[in-house]
Structures are given as C-alpha cells and as structure tokens.
Interface confidence: low
C-alpha cells in the first residue's frame, strides 16, 4: 500500500512543477484504489474551489496561478469512521513556475560527459533568488533545491550531479524563487541536455574520399558499427554543436550514417558516437578521433549542409 494503513497517498501528474496557466492532476490513492476524497491546502491562501467539495479519482487543477503554489493534503472517504474521513495524506508541494525572469543554466566542465564523472550544473541570475531548483524532464519527484549564493550582483547555485549513470542523463532546467514565496518559481531556464558517453561499443569513423583532401573537394564522414544504433552523433573539436543523423542498416549488417560536410575549406578533428532511440542522451564510447586535413588555401569556416543541433534538443527523439 502506498500510504500508511489509514493514510492516503497524494500525488501529482505529470509533475509537481507546474507552469503558470498550466494544469496538474492531483490523485488521492486510498485503500488500493481511488475513492472519494477531499483536498485542502495547508496555508492561508486557500483555493476557494476546494471548499466543501468532494472529488472522485483525480482532480484536474488549473489553470494554475501563483496562489495555487503550496502544500496540499487529501483525506480519503471512510464512511464507517467517526469523522467519515481518513487521516491526512502525505504533504504534496506544488510549485508554480513563470513568476520571475528565467535564470541561466550552465554545465561545468561541459554537457558531454563520461559515465562515472561528475558534472556541476550552475544556475545563475541577476534576479536575487533565495533558492534555486533543478529539475530533470520526465521526473515526477520534487526538484533538488539549493540556497542561492550572492556575489557581485549575481545569485547562483551549483548542483553537483554524479557519479553519472544513464538514469541521470536527460534534459535539465532550473528555476529560482524569491524570499517569502518559496514555491512560486521563476520561468524555467533554457533546457540543458546532459549526455553520458562511454556506455556502449565505439563506432568507427572514416572519411571519403580520405582524411587528406584538396581545398574545395567534397568530404563525407561515415560513422558505422555492428551495433544497431538508431542515431549517430558527429562532433568537431572546438565546436559546441553536434550533428546527428539516423543510422541506416547496410547490406554488410552494419549500421551507418554518412555526414556530408560539403566542400573542404579547413580541417579539424572529428569524433562520432552512437545512441539508441529509447535513451537518446546515453551515447556510446567515442570513435577514435579522425583528423581531416585540407591541402591548399584554408578559410575560416566549413559550411555545413547538415543543420547543427541547437544547444538542447539532443535528448529528444529524431522524428
């Protein structure tokens, strides 16, 4: 049983972190099922809709406002008891986002990490936030909370995540809250994808027509493996963005992606990684680095016909 003997279990779907104007389903699980229940909020800013109302199975709350932020409990229907209701459930904190300007989220040393390493996710803002919250997409549990540190007109918090394992990969966002309104959070930071590498066999990376080409000659980098990767990711040393392509099964039973780099203008060191659709943020070991050299006149950039991925979006599926 999720609650105690006479204690229901209150949960929120999809998450306890709800955007202002969004909706959240509150479910009161009691005696192995969803019976009639009543909801109440544990502070003075009561949400009038609850007063004297009885709900069945779940209650969709919304569109939420800052006043909805706070701690909720429920009581399950218990007709034969003295009061007619169970003991109060566990407390459930609902946090409402979108109340202040968004903070920024950075990863140190970077968002691409080896399994077992630790990453510091730094959330910062010029708004004097008292607390910062870090939330991973798709997780229904409460976000991690840290007290903000203030320095030189900036408030920030450093969340240490690690040792990294597949379950910790994913899309992170952070939020801030100001004094005296701890559950009224800011707008979310831009999403930051934390990618874990080193979990599967490395693919091989090759260049056509070869790793040394004439300036202006078309170059294609091929990433392939016997492993049935769904997606390949190509990164270039010194570039923030990776390129990604769907893997294509070949007649020799390998899985391959061909990255056309266009006319060669200058060289660089490339690596590729494989990943599976089910775990888009968990990548293979890196291929051996491939140094592409260009003879002739190098220019400052290499045009890319493949669209580089945005800062985030790595952890979304390729449709």
């Amino acid at each position: 049983l999720m609650g105690g003997q006479d204690k229901p279990f209150l949960s929120a779907r999809p998450s306890t972190v709800v955007p202002r104007g969004g909706h959240v389903a509150l479910q009161c699980h009691y005696r192995r099922g969803f019976n009639n229940f009543m909801l109440y909020k544990e502070d003075r800013s009561h949400v009038p809709i609850f007063h004297g109302r009885i709900f069945q199975e779940s209650f969709i709350m919304g569109p939420v406002t800052p006043a909805h932020a706070g701690t909720y409990r429920c009581r399950g229907s218990r007709p034969h008891s003295l009061t007619g209701w169970s003991a109060p459930s566990n407390p459930l904190v609902i946090m409402v986002t979108g109340n202040h300007r968004k903070p920024s989220l950075l990863a140190h040393p970077g968002p691409l990490l080896k399994s077992g390493e630790t990453v510091i996710l730094q959330c910062w803002s010029d708004v004097m936030f008292e607390h910062f919250f870090l939330h991973r997409e798709g997780i229904s549990e409460d976000p991690s909370r840290l007290v903000g540190q203030i320095h030189d007109g900036v408030s920030k918090a450093n969340f240490s995540i690690g040792p990294l394992m597949p379950v910790l990969a994913g899309t992170y966002r952070c939020y801030g809250s100001v004094p005296h309104s701890p559950y009224q959070l800011s707008a979310p930071s831009d999403p930051l994808d934390i990618v874990i590498t080193g979990l599967y066999e490395k693919p091989s990376l090759s260049a056509q027509p070869g790793p040394t080409v004439q300036a202006g000659e078309n170059v294609t980098l091929s990433c392939s493996s016997w492993s049935s990767y769904d997606i390949y990711h190509l990164s270039r040393e010194g570039e923030a963005h990776e390129r990604r392509l769907r893997a294509v099964p070949k007649v020799n039973r390998t899985f391959q992606a061909d990255f056309p780099l266009g006319p060669a203008t200058h060289g660089g060191t490339y690596r590729c990684f494989g990943s599976f659709r089910a775990l888009p943020c968990v990548w293979s070991n890196s291929s051996d680095p491939l140094l592409v050299s260009v003879t002739g006149n190098p220019s400052s950039s290499w045009p890319s016909p493949t669209e580089p991925s945005s800062k985030s979006g790595i952890c979304r599926h390729l449709h």
Epitope: Q149, I150, D152
Partner: antibody, heavy 120, light 107 residues
Framework: QVQLVQSGAELARPGASVKVSCKAS????????MHWVRQAPGQGLEWIGY????????ENNRKFKDKTTLTADKSTSTAYMELSSLRSEDTAVYYC?????????????WGQGTTVTVSS | DIQMTQSPSSLSASVGDRVTITCRAS??????LAWYQQKPGKAPQLLVY???NLADGVPSRFSGSGSGTDYTLTISSLQPEDFATYYC?????????FGGGTKLEIK
C-alpha cells in the same frame, strides 16, 4: 582581509535573552549569507541557521526555530543572533560563519566564537 | 534531514602515520561536503570543500575523496600540529548538518 569579529562572552540567568553580534569586514557584507553554528561544551558542531543580509531572509534549523532570531544591519555590516528563553542547555560557544562562493561553497571564514553561559 | 555519520569518533596515531577519517551521509549529497579542523578553544578552519578540493593554505598532506554518500579525509603523514578534532559537513540543502567529529590524539 576578511574578518568576522564577535561580541564578548555573556553570562545570563535562565529565562533571559542575549544578543550576540558578528561584525564583518574585508568584503561586501550583502553579497554572502551569514550562518550561525553552536558548540555545547565537549560536544560537536550544530548548524543553527542563516540570514541573507541583502534581503533579510532567514532560514533556521527546526531545532532552533523558537530559540533564535537572526537579524542583520547592513549599515554596520553586522549580523546578530538573539537567543531567548535561555536554559542551562543553551550554554555553548556560538560561532558566526560566512558561506563562501564558487563551486559547492563551504564556510570559508569563521568568527572567533562567543561563549554564552546560562546559570542561576 | 540528512544525517552525517563520522568514524571513528576518536583515533590515536603517531607522527608520520597515515590516517583516514570517513563520513557517511544518510542520502546522496553529490559532493556537497566540507572538512574542518578544530583545535581546543579555537574556531573550526576549512580544510577541504566540494569533497576533494583543498582550501587555500592547507598542506598537501591533507586530501579529500569520495562521492555519493561516502567521503574520506586522509592525512598522508601526520605532523605534530595535526592533532585536533575533525568535522565533516554537508551542504545538500538545509539544515547543513555536521558529522559528530573525530578526535585525533597522539599515541
């Protein structure tokens, strides 16, 4: 250089109140949170709570919620901790400490400590 | 609240010995841990922060290690001035609790 200088020892009767001060110098007072730590005779360290001198926001260890009041005076760069309804078990050395900055910051500077003795 | 369990509570050792003190958190504190040294009648002094980083001016014979719930402070070769009490403290959300302390005495 950063310094936290605390007020002198206090002798108080049970039921009385005392106010301990912590004067900060050598840095921007409002840019760091100030924390208070207690050490009873022969015992370990206990975190009491903190104040953000910039906003006045405080957060206390539940154990000390009704015992301590934390305040700060920005004009004098001084943090205060008031201990109320004193009992003999409140006899201890009380430290102020600054929470540093950077990655996963610790208490980087401490006051010298103020001994509070509660005795009838 | 997160509990910090420090062991041993006391330890006798000689100058030149290698000494290890451990601290276990009741849940993952993600390296949000500091170690302090305290001598009688004095305020604690920071030794290690973020589990593994040596504070300014701390001799290199001190080192911190660990992750998750288990952390260690090591003194590679004890010096006379190292005999003191050592505390760990977590910073993974308030209250920032300390370990019970380890008193390091001369054998």
């Amino acid at each position: 250089q950063v310094q936290l200088v605390q007020s002198g020892a206090e002798l108080a009767r049970p039921g009385a109140s005392v106010k301990v001060s912590c004067k900060a110098s050598g840095y921007t007072f409002t840019s760091y949170t100030m924390h208070w730590v207690r050490q009873a005779p022969g015992q370990g360290l206990e975190w009491i709570g903190y104040i953000n001198p910039s906003s006045g926001y405080t957060e206390n260890n539940r154990k000390f919620k009704d015992k301590t009041t934390l305040t700060a005076d920005k004009s004098t760069s001084t943090a205060y901790m008031e201990l109320s309804s004193l009992r003999s078990e409140d006899t201890a050395v009380y430290y102020c400490a600054r929470l540093g900055k950077g990655l996963l910051p610790p208490f980087d500077y401490w006051g010298q400590g103020t001994t509070v003795t509660v005795s009838s | 609240d997160i509990q910090m369990t420090q062991s041993p509570s006391s330890l006798s050792a000689s100058v030149g010995d290698r000494v290890t003190i451990t601290c276990r958190a009741s849940e993952n504190i993600y390296s949000n841990l500091a170690w302090y040294q305290q001598k009688p009648g004095k305020a604690p002094q920071l030794l290690v922060y973020a589990a593994t980083n040596l504070a300014d001016g701390v001799p290199s014979r001190f080192s911190g290690s660990g992750s998750g719930t288990d952390y260690t402070l090591t003194i590679s070769s004890l010096q006379p001035e190292d005999f003191a009490t050592y505390y760990c403290q977590h910073f993974w959300g308030t209250p920032y609790t300390f370990g019970g302390g380890t008193k390091l005495e001369i054998k």
